[in-house]
């Protein structure tokens, strides 16, 4: 039969709220060298126990009896400390354990999760979370909105998750946790109501250097919109703005619009250039989320200036004209040049030169026409740019280089003539 247990004092019980400090104690009486006392919690040896062992001899001789007291200190009681505690000693070839003591946690509910501050769009559903535990269980939750309970009694309404179908004003939410010991109140979460994301961002009109855009505002609850902000950013093909990418890769052009109307003219843009635009609207509570980036493009315009450095020389029945690309912005893709020449008493002749910047003209009448002048204009798909001032044909002087060019015969009828409104040519020779 087993030897009698050496334990003369067993651990007591501790029950308290979180954070409590307490001590478990066991005492044994042994003959000979005192053993090391180990503590078990739920059968597991506590390796990092905060324990102290005191040994008192009951006689003069080492082989006399000893009283051994082991104390286990529990600081700041937590749920992980709860369980059954025993002292354990190895004596010779035998193992002895004390009677168990119990450590329990009992107090006001303890929050594992509390509602968090957040922003939501007006009239948009969202969820809030709250979780609490005892012991003692059960723990019943009661949600409050702006300090008003959302249920008749704890445990009757929503518990861990509160579904809010939507708000039209900034509100506060908290939850109360109730158990047999009392009530704990969570932190108060502020739910800020922001305007909904604007919808249907679209182009109203396009000019080479400006775009007019409009959008439909989202709901903003009880808070009127104060303004909307529009951003435009140049979009190269390699730029990689995706529909939902949150930030543009370069500093955007930002404009503010007073509202209403929900419309804005964006100026100072580059012609014939792709952009991405987005809009957000702001109330006193803050800004809405941005719309997705919308790809837009400014149209081509006509060149803003005439070709430069026009020179025209005449040698008998031939005239050589050359010029340079306009210095002024082209506002699009240069498609070519138009040239017009006219004598004092002859009809104007219009020609499309294409992209060349020089031409040799074969003049009629063996060069007898007097006071010949030449004008040149550049054009894009949008139309003709301004014509140059008339340049008089100068007589060719020997020693001047005479380039060899394909001759362009002056037609007997003005086949190259264009309606004046088309080529914007209104000069008078």
């Amino acid at each position: 039969q087993a030897e009698e247990s050496p334990f003369v004092g067993n651990p007591g019980n501790i029950t308290g709220a979180r954070g409590l400090t307490g001590t478990l104690r066991c005492q044994l009486q042994v003959q000979g060298e005192p053993p090391e006392v180990h503590w078990l919690r739920d059968g597991q040896i506590l390796e990092l126990a905060d324990s102290t062992q005191t040994q008192v001899p009951l006689g003069e001789d080492e082989q006399d009896d000893w009283i051994v007291v082991s104390q286990l200190r529990i600081t700041s009681l937590q749920l992980s400390d709860t369980g059954q505690y025993q002292c354990l000693v190895f004596l010779g070839h035998q193992t002895f354990v004390s009677q168990p003591g119990y450590v329990g946690l009992e107090g006001l509910p303890y929050f594992l999760e509390e509602p968090e501050d957040r922003t939501v769009a007006a009239n948009t559903p969202f969820n809030l979370s709250c979780q609490a535990q005892g012991p003692p269980e059960p723990v019943d939750l009661l949600w409050l909105q702006d300090a008003v309970p959302l249920a008749t009694a704890p445990g009757h309404g929503p518990q861990r998750s509160l579904h809010v179908p939507g708000l039209n004003k900034t509100s506060s939410f908290s939850c109360e946790a109730h158990n047999a010991k009392g009530v704990t109140t969570s932190r108060t979460a502020t739910i800020t109501v922001l305007p909904q994301q604007p919808r249907n961002l679209h182009l109203v009109s396009r000019q080479p250097t400006e775009l007019e855009v409009a959008w439909t505002p989202g709901l903003s609850g009880i808070y009127p919109l104060t303004h909307c902000t529009l951003q435009a950013v140049l979009s190269d093909d390699g730029m990689g703005i995706q529909a939902g990418e949150p930030d543009p890769p370069e500093e955007p052009l930002t404009s503010q619009a007073s509202v209403p109307p929900h419309q804005l003219r964006l100026g100072s843009l580059h012609p014939h250039t792709p952009y991405h635009i987005r809009v957000a609207c702001t109330s006193s509570q803050g800004p809405s989320s941005w719309t997705h980036w919308l790809p837009v493009e400014t149209p081509e315009g006509v060149p803003l200036g005439p070709p430069e450095n026009i020179s025209a020389t005449r040698n008998g029945s031939q005239a050589f004209v050359h010029w340079q690309e306009p210095r002024a912005p082209l506002q699009g893709t240069l498609l070519g040049y138009r040239l017009a020449y006219q004598g004092q008493d002859t009809p104007e002749v219009l020609m499309d030169i294409g992209l060349r910047q020089e031409v040799t003209l074969e003049l009629q009448g063996d060069g007898s026409v007097s006071n010949l002048t030449v004008c040149v204009a550049a054009y894009t798909a949008a139309g003709d740019g301004p014509w140059s001032l008339p340049v008089p044909l100068e007589a060719w002087r020997p020693g001047q280089a005479q380039p060899v060019h394909q001759l362009v015969k002056e037609p007997s009828t003005p086949a190259f003539s264009w309606p004046h409104h088309h080529h914007h040519h209104h000069h008078h020779h």
Epitope: A2, S5, D42, Q44, I45, E47, L88, T95, V97, Q99
Partner: antibody
Framework: QVQLVQSGAEVKKPGASVKVSCKAS????????INWVKQAPGQGLEWIGW????????KYNEKFKGRVTLTVDTSISTAYMELSRLRSDDTAVYYC?????????WGQGTLVTVSS | EIVLTQSPATLSLSPGERATLSCSAS?????MYWYQQKPGQSPRSLIY???NLASGIPARFSGSGSGTDYTLTISSLEPEDFAVYYC?????????FGQGTKLEIK
């Protein structure tokens, strides 16, 4: 001296239940935890759970939770392990073992064979 | 859970030789325990609290180690020592065992 004596081998069909017993002697039965350990053929050892006979408190390995039930009858110093919804991979030797922070005494083992 | 890895899986030695069995834990533990199992028998406790000999275990067995690395040493092998040896931890739940080292006669 401490002794743990287990019940004999069992052959069961898949889906059935088995109840293995472990009779303790030579020490105060209610003071020490009784653990159960599984050893599949040619395999290592796997802890199933424990029961404290003094209170009936139990703790289970998550892997076995829901299919295993540990009980005791202190009047006859006997611990029981019941395993339900048996599957072929439950075929193993099941040991009871007394624990004092480790497994100091073991039963002789009970072979449970699950076969259709 | 803490995983215990024993090495070598098999150790072939002759009687009289020294045997060193290793057990490595996947995270730091406070104590290691060792068991011996012979074919057809139940495990038997050898070492507890890392270095203490269990009841009836001869002094040629010893244990050592700390943190993640632990060792069981048999100073001079006897014929009855050829068996499978398991290490075990209970620093964290659930208690786990190593996969075993088989000590066989060379």
């Amino acid at each position: 001296q401490v002794q743990l004596v287990q019940s004999g081998a069992e052959v069961k069909k898949p889906g059935a239940s088995v109840k293995v017993s472990c009779k303790a002697s030579g020490y105060p039965f209610t003071d020490f935890y009784i653990n159960w350990v599984k050893q599949a053929p040619g395999q290592g050892l796997e802890w199933i759970g424990w029961i404290y006979p003094g209170s009936g408190n139990t703790k289970y390995n998550e892997k076995f939770k829901g299919r295993v039930t540990l009980t005791v009858d202190t009047s006859i110093s006997t611990a029981y392990m019941e395993l339900s919804r048996l599957r072929s991979d439950d075929t193993a030797v099941y040991y009871c073992a007394r624990s004092t922070g480790f497994f100091d005494y073991w039963g002789q083992g009970t072979l449970v064979t699950v076969s259709s | 859970e803490i995983v215990l890895t024993q090495s070598p899986a098999t150790l072939s030695l002759s009687p009289g030789e020294r045997a060193t069995l290793s057990c490595s834990a996947s995270s730091s533990i406070g104590y290691m325990y060792w068991y011996q199992q012979k074919p057809g028998q139940s495990p038997r406790s050898l070492i507890y609290l890392t270095s203490n000999l269990a009841s009836g275990i001869p002094a040629r067995f010893s244990g050592s180690g700390s943190g993640t690395d632990y060792t069981l040493t048999i100073s001079s092998l006897e014929p009855e020592d050829f068996a499978v040896y398991y290490c075990q931890q209970w620093s964290s739940n659930p208690p786990t065992f190593g996969q075993g080292t088989k000590l066989e006669i060379k």
